[in-house]
């Protein structure tokens, strides 16, 4: 689980370059309690 | 009633392991990420990491690289966490949280 | 890390009147696609926490609307317009621009 932060708010994980908060308007539940299906 | 229920509190000594639960009950817990947080006595939140069910990849904090463990047991609907080497500041409530349910919280005592 | 802070960490607030928590962020939340990702939390005693606020100004479902938030990118304040007997607890900014760090808490109580 290589994890490298970068200033720039995104990071390197498992080799690819993700912005870590950009899944928050998904339907994955990234947002801590937030219920999924509500209103986003 | 949907809810996460977790196991119950936990002592262990130093250097031990743990392995939290979190069971979701009228709820599938392999469907949405689910995050563990601890909160230190008297203290603040503090976020561990997040593991997507569906393909067990996982993002920690950096500090507990090394210190905790996520899984999903998919055919159980239940999660989990270990933590290893344990030392006494490990001493804490733990939270599961999925979508908008969070666990009732599990303390784990490190102490010899 | 972004580093949270709060002040006050201790709000002594009386019933029906309004209150307000400051959450300060060590680098800009606000991200280039217009989101700000900073996050009210609230834990009441003996409870587990819930999520209030989301993405600075969203309401959290069931969450009533006399809570507010706004700010800037570094600055943001949690309002409540009357404070009502069920509101103690301790209330905790949150950001997850980078991961998820918390700030340290404020202890809101009756007076």
């Known amino acids: 689980d290589a994890e490298f932060r970068h200033d720039s708010g995104y990071e390197v994980h498992h080799q690819k370059l993700v912005f870590f908060a950009e899944d928050v308007g998904s339907n994955k539940g990234a947002i801590i309690g937030l219920m999924v299906g509500g209103v986003v | 009633q949907v809810q996460l229920v977790q196991s119950g509190a936990e002592v262990k000594e130093p250097g031990a392991s743990v392995k939290v639960s979190c069971k979701g009950s009228?709820?599938?817990?392999?469907?949405?990420?689910v995050h563990w947080l601890r909160q230190l006595p008297e203290k603040g939140l503090e976020w561990i990491g997040r593991?997507?069910?569906?393909?067990?990849?996982?993002i920690y904090t950096p500090k507990f690289q090394d210190k905790a463990t996520l899984t999903v047991d998919t055919s159980t609907d239940t999660a989990y966490m270990e933590l290893s080497s344990l030392r006494s500041e490990d001493t804490a409530v733990y939270y599961c949280v999925s979508s908008g349910y969070w666990g009732q919280g599990t303390l784990v005592t490190v102490s010899s | 890390d972004i580093v949270m802070t709060q002040s006050p960490l201790s709000n002594p607030v009386t019933p029906g009147e309004p209150a307000s928590i400051s959450c300060r962020s060590s680098k800009s939340l606000l991200h280039r696609n217009g989101k700000t990702y900073l996050y009210w939390y609230l834990q009441k005693p003996g409870q587990s926490p819930q999520l209030l606020i989301y993405q600075m100004d969203h309401l959290a479902s069931g969450v009533p609307d006399r809570f507010s938030s706004s700010g800037s990118g570094t600055d943001f304040t949690l309002k409540i317009s009357r404070v009502e007997a069920e509101d103690v607890g301790v209330y905790y900014c949150a950001q997850n621009l980078e991961l998820w760090t918390f700030g340290q808490g404020t202890k809101v109580e009756i007076k």
């Open positions: 593991i997507d069910p569906e393909n067990g990849e996982t």
């Open positions: 009228g709820f599938n817990i392999h469907t949405y990420y």
